[in-house]
Amino acid sequence: SWMWNQFFLLEEYTGSDYQYVGKLHSDQDRGDGSLKYILSGDGAGDLFIINENTGDIQATKRLDREEKPVYILRAQAINRRTGRPVEPESEFIIKIHDINDNEPIFTKEVYTATVPEMSDVGTFVVQVTATDADDPTYGNSAKVVYSILQGQPYFSVESETGIIKTALLNMDRENREQYQVVIQAKDMGGQMGGLSGTTTVNITLTDVNDNPPRFPQSTYQFKTPESSPPGTPIGRIKASDADVGENAEIEYSITDGEGLDMFDVITDQETQEGIITVKKLLDFEKKKVYTLKVEASNPYVEPRFLYLGPFKDSATVRIVVEDVDEPPVFSKLAYILQIREDAQINTTIGSVTAQDPDAARNPVKYSVDRHTDMDRIFNIDSGNGSIFTSKLLDRETLLWHNITVIATEINNPKQSSRVPLYIKVLDVNDNAPEFAEFYETFVCEKAKADQLIQTLHAVDKDDPYSGHQFSFSLAPEAASGSNFTIQDNKDNTAGILTRKNGYNRHEMSTYLLPVVISDNDYPVQSSTGTVTVRVCACDHHGNMQSCHAEALIHPTGLSTGA
């Protein structure tokens, strides 16, 4: 039977001779050279050689356990003379014994990690891992221990796990953002003589909102013309915040000051500046300077940092309103004046007033816009704004005169303003009433006395306050011996009545009847109108059948025969 146990061979042999492995030996071997030993299998004849007489095995090359830890070979012992095996072929193992010839190697040459600034001590950052190719089952060749070579006192590493943690309180990104940490992994449990490897860990502190916004100055001053429309930007202010990104976002607001209602502040969404804008129309003459208290605050605040103080800051903004030369302002938006139509030329109707609203209070001169008074009926005193007539008026021609008055700054003619002036012409009884139409009527030859042959109506261009009251009568020269009578109906109408029974058209074909119409106003106005009455032949119903042709061409005028 074979006489051997497992063979062990130390790796990485560096001697000058072949490395002795062990001896194959059969108890049939009497030492007389009659047996021959043969080796086959992993590396036989190349890595491993055997002395066929003695059975001694040697390794011809330096072996690396990490490359191949076990070799499986087969042994034979045969009788040289007969060539027959004296032992059955048997498998045996050469196990390569580990030495500490491999240093730990990290899974990454460079690690990148982040951790929030101001983290508590012991906050996990990243875990690094190193592996050692040596035999973990034998000795400490592969027992890795981690340590920090660079990066203290900021970070620490757990020796067994490779977990990197923060080691210093209140690490501030605004102070230092980047850290390069060097970690060593050493085998042999970290003991002397152990092999080591290193890796670099680049650690970036990420931002947290641990800084409030701060105005670089306590007071800002801007100017804006009083003419700036609402929405106009008038200046920019900027609070700085040492944080970044969302933590550096700033909201601006006006918290106090007389300009609270007059101005607004918005945040420029890109530059994070505060833009002061006009909210309402300004007036230099009312207020020349405004003071605002503007606050800058972080919209997103981390409660754990509130102990550092409020996450806001305020500054005073002084806004100077600049005077803009404004046109004169009339005391009214429109003027309504009245004047009697019988007013003499140069009669004063009333006056307008305009003032320069500017602090300078420049004097103004007045004028009438002649496009609105082409006939030059009115004029104005350029100095005091008195309006007076320059022509006679007639209410019956034009009741309202709509003119425009201009006020112009004497020192700056470009600055002018206009106001409408509505002048009402008041009625005076200067028109006599007259017939509403031309009256030409007829009377039947067989008419009876007191028969109504025509109703008269009158009109008057005047417009008396209490309404028209007309009276009608026959003209004095026709009143006596007239063939007709006038009956005043007291309702601004009158009737013509026959005064006798029967008329003869052959005797008198046409009567001209003069009628006096008077009004009831002061001074009384009257006129005389003529009514033409033709005598006609009529049927028994009183319908006209024929009249004298002369009547159609008879001149109008007074007829003594009426």
Partner: antibody, heavy 121, light 107 residues
């Protein structure tokens, strides 16, 4: 005077690409976020993309309908805005406007004349 | 995403009329973030009212804006012939969104 002039529009087949440019002048380009807005024929306005300023790392935002197909970019040294349009679809047919916000980067105050992109086979 | 709904979608009115267009947001927004635009056929949109209330440069005073939270309004006090156009509201929170538009036509 603020001026925005778009170019690069034209006829392209579905699946094709096109690059629009916008030349800006009359204002400080570097302080404004910039946008592309489009309008399909006879339809309403649709925002396409926005790019922020350098301070904000040139952050970009897109409408869902163009995400992963369109890329907005800017060249501050040339006062120029770009829109790279890939994998074009027929529904991308529209007039594309280059638009600058108002002061404070609110609203869309200044619009170019637009450039027509037609996607058709 | 914040949706904006304009009403009415279209509107017929006469010169001199007072017109109101409303814009309703699906969730509350700051008045700073709501704006109104006018667009005429074949033209680029024009900023009309910014930050809910403020008239853009050159915009006549007959235009006004109001509102807060989720409800905003554009008012034209006395329509002029040049006001017939399409009006859009828009909000600033990414993704920026527009209302569907209100077409104002001559009656």
């Amino acid at each position: 005077e603020v001026q925005l002039v778009e170019s690069g529009g034209g006829l392209v087949q579905p699946g094709g690409s096109l690059r629009l440019s916008c030349a800006a002048s009359g204002f400080t380009f570097t302080t404004y976020a910039m946008n592309w807005v489009r309008q399909a024929p006879g339809k309403g306005l649709e925002w396409v993309a926005r790019i922020r300023i350098k301070n904000n790392n040139y952050a970009t935002y897109y409408a869902d309908s163009v995400t992963d197909r369109f890329t907005i970019s800017r060249d501050d040294s040339k006062n120029s805005l770009y829109l790279q349009m890939n994998s074009l679809k027929t529904e991308d047919t529209a007039v594309y406007y280059c638009v600058r916000p108002d002061y404070g980067n609110y609203g869309l105050a200044y619009w170019g004349q637009g450039t027509l992109v037609t996607v058709s086979s | 995403d914040i949706q904006l709904t304009q009403s009415p979608s279209s509107l017929s009115a006469s010169v001199g009329d007072r017109v109101t267009i409303t814009c309703s947001a699906s969730s509350s927004i700051s008045s700073h973030y709501l704006h109104w635009y006018q667009q005429k056929p074949g033209k680029s949109p024009k900023l009309l009212i910014y930050r809910s209330f403020y008239l853009a440069s050159g915009v006549p005073s007959r235009f006004s804006g109001s509102g807060s939270g989720t409800d905003f309004t554009l008012t034209i006090s006395s329509l002029q012939p040049e006001d017939f156009a399409t009006y859009y509201c828009q909000q600033d929170i990414v993704p920026l969104t527009f209302g569907q538009g209100t077409k104002l036509e001559i009656k």
